[in-house]
């Protein structure tokens, strides 16, 4: 572990209350194929415990969705991954809109510091799928 | 190699017969930029040879496709990556539908064990592109 | 550094002149969360300085885009990542079309050699977003 191979892969637990756009995550072998090895969860949000450059990746699929579903709703459905705390480091790292699709998936390299908490904000009014092969979020430490 | 840096990047060889939704892969420098360093191919399916957490990634593009192609077909075109053998470990790891798009691309971290064979099932009646820059599938061992 | 952990994450600087489909990138902490640790930029194009297998990833979002924007334009908007120099190694590594979406994102493993310059060609007449959470391009050395 001293090599700094911090890594986590999370599955969706639930969405937040109406005014809270954050997705709440869970992880652990008992839940399926999700795990936390280094990073930790704080009220469903992922907290980094080791400084470094991380590969952050995410896939979110909307529930009961067809190519026309997203066009039925007035507000665009957008997923943003960012550092939400500490407030001094708050920034959006990765952002995608669904448009006429039902799934977004992406990844990026970004420096993260111990104590950074990552939030995944799903704006719009569509419920994401909780299937573990359709919606997941993970980080992988890749170098100091 | 003892570090466990198992890695593979594959290109599409062919689709299966009509009732077989699996994509059949190939790899090796003679074929282009695909390679297998650790994992192996068993009848076009990728077999893992070392336990660990892997980053699995895939991109599949449909052949002769426009944004209307996928909507013309009644059956949704879906790509699922999963462990197909041994049967006791069979599970879907990653799933995406094309909807009104012609390409899906995603990645995830997942624990895999020696002997796990990964299958990539393309359901629907649309043919995937065999261009090596449009359709590819790979795994990378990232930690024990 | 001797471990060969070459890595870079870039943000969009600007597009090329009318007949030049290349995207021009920039990187460095002063610019935000982009960085170059090993690879270098040559006139906005990424040059590799160490042989090995790399994970290449990209996300490009079109500016002022809705699901109908891309369908309004006659020429399909396509993003291709490839080796553009040296000419002897010129090849397309990864290619995606936007179709009715506004964002493409993908990743792949590929062998790269010292001196390879990667180009990201955006064909079509739509302007990409320069927002750093919407458009980015990166490489990560993963093994010799």
């Amino acid at each position: 572990e001293s090599l700094g191979w911090d890594i986590a892969e999370l599955q969706l637990n639930h969405t937040g209350p109406q005014q809270d756009p954050r997705l709440y995550w869970q992880g652990g072998p008992a839940l399926g194929r999700s795990f936390l090895r280094g990073p930790e969860l704080d009220k469903g949000q992922l907290r980094i415990r080791r400084d470094g450059i991380y590969m952050v990746h995410i896939q979110v699929t909307l529930a009961i969705c067809s190519s026309t579903s997203t066009s039925r709703h007035h507000h665009p459905t957008t997923l943003a991954v960012g550092i939400c705390s500490p407030a001094s480091r708050s920034i959006s790292l990765l952002r995608l809109s669904f448009h006429q699709g039902c799934t977004i998936a992406s990844q990026r390299l970004t420096p993260l510091a111990r104590g950074d908490t990552l939030c995944t904000n799903l704006t719009g009014t569509l419920l994401p799928s909780r299937n573990t092969d359709e919606t997941f979020f993970g980080v992988q430490w890749v170098r100091p | 190699e003892s570090l466990g840096w198992d890695i593979a990047e594959l290109q599409l060889n062919h689709t299966g017969p009509q009732q077989d939704p699996r994509l059949y892969w190939q790899g090796g420098p003679a074929l282009g930029r695909s390679f297998l360093r650790g994992p192996e191919l068993d009848k076009g399916q990728l077999r893992i040879r070392r336990d660990g957490i892997y980053m699995v990634h895939i991109q599949v593009t449909l052949a002769i496709c426009s944004s209307t192609s996928t909507s013309r077909h009644h059956h949704p075109t879906t790509l699922a990556v999963g462990i197909c053998s041994p049967a006791s470990r069979s599970i879907s790891l990653l799933r995406l539908s094309f909807h009104q798009g012609c390409t899906i691309a995603s990645q995830r971290l997942t624990p895999l064990a020696r002997g796990d064979t990964l299958c990539t099932n393309l359901t629907g009646t649309l043919l995937p592109s065999r261009n090596t820059d449009e359709t590819f599938f790979g795994v990378q061992w990232v930690r024990p | 550094e001797s471990l060969g952990w070459d890595i870079a994450e870039l943000q969009l600087n600007h597009t090329g002149p009318q007949q030049d489909p290349r995207l021009y990138w920039q990187g460095g902490p002063a610019l935000g969360r982009s960085f170059l640790r090993g690879p270098e930029l040559d006139k906005g194009q990424l040059r590799i300085r160490r042989d090995g297998i790399y994970m290449v990833h990209i996300q490009v979002t079109l500016a002022i885009c809705s699901s109908t924007s891309t369908s309004r334009h006659h020429h399909p908007t396509t993003l291709a990542v490839g080796i553009c120099s040296p000419a002897s190694r010129s090849i397309s590594l990864l290619r995606l079309s936007f179709h009715q979406g506004c964002t493409i994102a993908s990743q792949r493993l590929t062998p790269l050699a010292r001196g390879d310059t990667l180009c990201t060609n955006l064909t079509g007449t739509l302007l990409p977003s320069r927002n750093t959470d919407e458009t980015f391009f990166g490489v990560q050395w993963v093994r010799p």
Partner: antibody, heavy 120, light 111 residues
Framework: EVQLQESGPGLVQPSQSLSITCTVS????????VHWVRQSPGKGLEWLGV???????DYNADFISRLSISKDNSKSQVFFKMDSLQSDDTAIYFC??????????????WGQGTSVTVSS | DIVLTQSPASLAVSLGQRATISCRAS??????????MHWYQQKPGQPPKLLIY???NLESGVPARFSGSGSGTDFTLNIHPVEEEDAATYYC?????????FGGGTKLEIK
């Protein structure tokens, strides 16, 4: 406070059209979808159709040929029109707001309903 | 169309006891990690009122004595302890696919 109020004719002649207006307050039609449901002693509760926040509509296939739903966002009104009514269309007609989650399709607020009798 | 069959059609439960109402779907209404089944209460002369959504989520303002469970094709609404004001007809509704359909209703009487 969220409210929906239907206003309709009460009595409709057989083969004629039924028009109902649903006036809403406490929420915006640009954010929420509105469903139409009817209730009769013979058939219980029947979902008829929905108009989404964008104005796109979905209808129960059994009614698609004779049903249209439209709206005026600025007036906070949804309009329901069903053609060729017969006696078995006699029912209470409700408009109902879709739940906050657009793809959940539960109905969290309902109008009081308007009673429609089809008779000559 | 998905047919929802409720049972029993009516039941009488003593004050303070448990009322259990069943709803069976002709095919699974579970997908995407949720069960798209909802429960409503309707009193005479009033519109239906949403009690439970996604099989087990209590709608805001609904008393905690109401609970829902189930997945796939079999769902249950429980009321415990039953109170006088719970006398009503209860309906299940699915939203797995179009058209959305309702169960035939279960009339609850308090003894």
């Amino acid at each position: 406070e969220v409210q929906l109020q239907e206003s309709g004719p009460g009595l409709v002649q057989p083969s004629q059209s039924l028009s109902i207006t649903c006036t809403v307050s406490g929420f915006s039609l640009t954010t929420y979808a509105v469903h139409w449901v009817r209730q009769s002693p013979g058939k219980g509760l029947e979902w008829l159709g929905v108009i989404w926040s964008t104005g796109i509509t979905d209808y129960n296939a059994d009614f698609i040929s004779r049903l249209s739903i439209s709206k005026d966002n600025s007036k906070s009104q949804v309009f329901f029109k069903m053609d060729s009514l017969q006696s078995d269309d006699t029912a209470i007609y409700f408009c109902a707001r879709n739940h906050y989650y657009g793809n959940l399709n539960a109905m969290d607020y309902w109008g009081q309903g308007t009673s429609v009798t089809v008779s000559s | 169309d998905i047919v929802l069959t409720q049972s029993p059609a009516s039941l009488a439960v003593s004050l303070g006891q448990r009322a259990t109402i069943s709803c069976r779907a002709s095919k699974s209404v579970s997908t995407s990690g949720y069960s798209f089944m909802h429960w409503y209460q309707q009193k005479p002369g009033q519109p239906p009122k949403l009690l439970i959504y996604l099989a087990s989520n209590l709608e805001s303002g609904v008393p905690a004595r109401f609970s829902g469970s189930g997945s796939g094709t079999d769902f249950t609404l429980n009321i415990h302890p039953v109170e006088e004001e719970d006398a009503a007809t209860y309906y299940c509704q699915h939203s797995r696919e179009l058209p959305y359909t309702f169960g035939g209703g279960t009339k609850l009487e308090i003894k």
